[in-house]
Interface confidence: low
């Protein structure tokens, strides 16, 4: 039977009345043009919502906003185009928020041709007021403002200046003139790029890497010859142009680009690209693209100085530079990631790691699925997942894949199964335990959504035609119930939840269409009244992560422990609450070969543990660039993989020598950098 | 051999609904996705939709959404094609043909489409009051 | 959806002469694209797909090239059966389409 229909389904009680009474409607004031929406600060059920109209005129484009405040999580809202005098807002910039709790906004606004600067309007109490400022620049990007002070905002200009403001963008200086990128870092630093010559496009791979770490006061330049750079973690990355050829190599640092050295990467060429895909402090993973326009490349992991790496996957699907990945990182479980890889026969296939890009596998078959046509043999396939390759190719995928870190275990997809992902209507699949298993659960898209830190999840069906009925489970997805919202079917544009899945209201967006008008409107459903009670012990059962075999002493263990979750039995109806915090009990496991990766000059043979030497480098002295002098390396071919926490059992060893040398191949060297102050 | 074996040729009143059958033989039937495809009298061919023979999810053309039902019996390797508030302008030989477009999914450089290499000898069906 | 554009209507040739059929698509189908040919009273049949590769059994005087929006079908020396309509369809998204058909017929 579908999911959700067998008879152990029990039904919450009263549902209907219950969400009834915590349906509020919001019809908005407009013509519908263009809807955006963003949360203001963590837990103040403060959103702004930003409508915006163009009328093309026969000359110019005439364009209206209205702007609109919730300080109940979307139930009731209310005008605020006044306050930011009725100007009309770009939406391209979006609504700039401060980090954390700031209650900080940034709008900014279209002003007229020929005016001297840009506008901006500004608010520091959650929207409730805003002050205007006339910018002495035009601005090309959003204000973005430092993560370590809300009060210092960086942005850049139509003229490529670097522009910074130091008291939330009421006075602004510009620090920096031919800027093409620029950067917040740690501490309040800024790093850009800037080019001599001509332009920004004219000068890449000629460009300046520039750091100041007293918002414009001193400079120093940390890099020459760079095409692009990036942060990610604790590393600085750059891509430098080699002096030979136009070929590039990835550098990196770990103190803020005073020293570099040179990643153990393969070079490319003009045509290719390479791609941080995730990073943390710990380590990186990086997709170095094919030579020639084939859509893919392969995965390289790093070890814990960003400067070693192991190939992790190969044919990795990325379609171009800027283009599209299936790269996911399941926060809902440690060490999982899902990607896409192109097959030799053009086909599209999901893998899966848990270890972090250690290993990769297909997903396994849901219990409750055939395979379709895909699948040379029927009886065994894998679950495909669609991601923002199948979205960006206009298949029928409304939404990515979703994991939240506090809903533990759980992923949602749309996918199908066989021997390839299919071109045909895909169904949605969910994951209780972090990617292992898949069970179907619900036919055909649907738009999905996570609340009360996986209590409630939520669920519209995707369609062409108007709707008025949500789905919504209590028991991670196995059983659904369908609510009707409203009596007259909208035209639905999408679901609203605030960030981080602690809330328990929804909101569901879309537009009513008359005869002669449209207009936006918002249902905010608020599910407290589903879940009655606040969740007790009883209501937790204990759940061991990555457990794959019970028998097994070091079952569960990856990365170099373990860990044990409190969750939510899926037969409780109740609250986590807002304030829940997931529960987990970690424990450190014995070294074995697999927590450690192959060092340079090494790697591991298909479905083999040891590290071999690589047979071009046997009997060579293993040499590499490291801060701009040549090391030499004696190993034994291991290397702790970055972020395992393993003791004890097996510990190969492992010997750095500094050959006092200077690395000829490393265009970053110290003694190539300078200093100067304004 | 490999063939598509369709149902005989159907008149129908407008308003009413036609089902047409197409049995395959000779491959296995689950292996590959079954379109269909009308051609109305002097006009060119029109695809109205395709169906997975394993699970029998199936995608239609926007135009028929609503009035084509695609389904199939795997016990008899058929599949059906029922369309229904019949009009005049639904006049037309009705085909089914193989399609493997669902064996290599979109790739990059493009999914490697196969074409219909089968197809079946037609179903005429007359719109008439 | 994507409209598959083909030209000429008709296409008027003699016997032993060379042939070439063009389609073009609204927007790009990369190489999912096959040819078809229908002669009255008969159902399609499958010349070319993935843009360039013949099916089985297809004689060699047909060819296909072509990626992405424009593509094209050439028949090298016509013969007296090859006189029919011919159909181009793309795969890319769905709906899958087809050409409006070019018919060759004998000058």
């Known amino acids: 039977s579908a999911p959700g229909e067998d008879e152990e389904c029990g039904r919450v009680r009263d549902f209907v009345a219950k969400l009834a009474n915590n349906t509020h409607q919001h019809v908005f004031d407009d013509l519908r043009g263009s809807v955006s929406l963003s949360w203001v600060g963590d837990s103040t059920g403060v959103i702004l919502v930003l409508t915006t109209f163009h009328v093309p005129l026969v000359i110019m484009t005439f364009g209206q906003s209205k702007l609109y405040r919730s300080e109940d999580y979307g139930k009731n809202f209310k005008d605020i185009t006044d306050l930011i005098n009725n100007t009309f807002i770009r939406t391209e910039f979006g609504m700039a928020i401060g980090p954390e709790n700031s209650g900080k906004v940034v709008l900014t606004a279209e002003v007229s041709g020929g005016s001297r600067g840009g506008r901006i309007f500004r608010s520091s109490d959650f929207a409730k007021n805003f002050v205007q400022t006339d910018l002495p620049f035009h601005p090309l990007t959003q204000m973005m403002y430092s993560p370590q002070n809300s009060d210092y905002l960086l942005a850049l200009s139509t003229e490529n200046g670097l522009w910074v403001s130091k008291n939330f963008g009421g006075k602004w200086e510009e620090i920096h003139k031919a800027v093409c990128l620029a950067k917040w870092g740690s501490d309040n630093t800024i790093f850009f790029t800037t080019y001599a010559n001509g332009s920004c496009k004219a000068d890449l791979g000629a460009l300046e890497l520039w750091r100041t770490s007293d918002l414009g006061k001193s400079f120093k330049t940390i890099g020459v010859k760079i095409y692009s750079f990036g942060l990610g973690g604790r590393f600085l990355f750059a891509s430098v142009m080699a002096d030979k050829d136009t070929t590039r190599r990835i550098h990196v640092s770990t103190d803020q680009g005073d020293t570099w050295s040179m990643a153990q990467l393969p070079s490319v060429g003009q045509e290719q690209f390479y791609s941080i895909l995730a990073a943390n402090d710990d380590m990186v993973f990086m997709h170095v693209d094919e030579p020639g326009d084939t859509g893919f490349g392969t995965i390289f992991t790093s070890d814990d100085r960003g400067i070693v790496y192991s190939k992790s996957l190969d044919r990795h699907l990325y379609t171009t530079t800027g283009g599209e990945t299936d790269f996911t990182n399941v926060t809902s479980l440690r060490g999982v990631y899902i990607t896409s890889v192109l097959s030799e026969d053009n086909s599209i296939q999901t893998m899966i790691t848990f270890d972090q890009g250690g290993r990769w596998t297909h997903l396994r078959k849901p219990e409750n699925s055939e395979c379709d046509a895909t699948a040379k043999n029927k009886n065994e396939c894998s679950l495909h997942i669609h991601a923002s390759y199948s979205i960006s190719q206009k298949l029928n995928v409304p939404m990515a894949p979703l994991s939240e870190p506090n809903a533990v275990g759980i992923v949602i997809a749309h996918g199908s199964v066989g021997d390839a992902i299919s071109v045909m209507v895909p169904d949605v699949y969910i994951s209780d335990d972090g990617g292992y298993s898949w069970t179907k659960m619900l036919e055909g898209p649907h738009y999905y959504t996570i609340l009360d830190s996986g209590g409630i999840i939520v669920a519209i069906e995707h369609s062409s035609r108007p709707i008025n009925v949500i789905k919504f489970s209590t028991d991670e997805g196995q059983c659904w119930q369908t609510y009707t919202f409203t009596r007259d079917p909208i035209y639905f544009t999408g679901l609203a939840s605030e960030p981080g899945a602690r809330s328990m209201n929804i909101s569901i967006w879309g537009f009513t269409e008359s005869f002669l008008t449209s207009q936006w409107v918002s249902y905010t459903i608020d599910f407290k009244d589903i879940l009655e009670r606040n969740c007790e012990e009883k209501d937790y059962t204990i759940w061991l992560a990555h457990s794959t075999d019970p028998e097994d002493y070091e079952d569960g263990c990856i990365l170099g422990y373990k860990e044990q979750f409190l969750r939510l039995r899926k037969s409780s109806v109740c609250q986590n609450g807002r304030d829940y915090v997931v529960t987990k009990q970690p424990s450190i496991c014995l070294c074995s070969l697999e927590d450690f990766l192959c060092d340079f000059g090494y790697y591991r043979p298909e479905n083999d543990s040891k590290c071999v030497e690589q047979p071009e480098l046997k009997g060579h002295d293993l040499e590499f660039c490291l801060y701009g002098r040549e090391e030499h390396l004696t190993t034994n071919g291991y290397r702790k993989i970055p972020g395992d926490k393993c003791q004890g059992g097996v510990n190969p060893v492992r010997e750095v020598k500094d050959l006092k040398k200077k690395c000829t191949s490393n265009f970053l060297s110290p003694e190539k950098q300078n200093s100067k102050s304004n | 051999q490999v063939q598509l074996v369709q149902s005989g040729a159907e008149v129908k009143k407008p308003g009413a609904s036609v089902k047409v059958s197409c049995k395959a033989s000779?491959?296995?039937?689950?292996?590959?996705?079954m379109s269909w495809v009308r051609q109305a009298p002097g006009q060119g061919l029109e695809w109205m939709g395709i169906?997975?023979?394993?699970?029998?999810?199936?995608s239609y053309a926007q135009k028929f959404q609503g009035r084509v039902t695609m389904t199939r019996d795997t016990s008899t390797s058929t599949v059906y094609m029922e369309l229904s508030s019949l009009r005049s302008e639904d006049t037309a030989v009705y085909y089914c043909?193989?399609?493997?477009?669902?064996?290599?999914?979109?790739?990059?450089?493009?999914?490697?489409?196969?074409?219909?290499?089968?197809w079946g000898q037609g179903t005429t069906v007359t719109v008439s009051s | 959806e994507i409209v598959m554009t083909q030209s000429p209507a008709t296409l008027s040739v003699s016997p032993g002469e060379r042939a070439t059929l063009s389609c073009r698509a609204s927007q790009s189908v990369s190489s999912n694209l096959a040819w078809y040919q229908q002669k009255p009273g008969q159902a399609p049949r499958l010349l070319i797909y993935g843009a360039s590769t013949r099916a089985t059994g297809i004689p060699a005087r047909f060819s296909g090239s072509g990626s992405g929006t424009e593509f094209t079908l050439t028949i090298s020396s016509l013969q007296s059966e090859d006189f029919a309509v011919y159909y181009c369809q793309q795969a890319r998204l769905g709906p899958w389409t087809f050409g409006g058909g070019t018919k060759v017929e004998i000058k």
């Open positions: 000779g491959y296995t039937f689950t292996k590959y996705y």
């Open positions: 169906i997975n023979p394993i699970g029998g999810s199936a």
């Open positions: 043909a193989r399609d493997p477009s669902g064996i290599a999914a979109a790739g990059p450089a493009g999914r490697y489409y196969y074409g219909m290499d089968v």
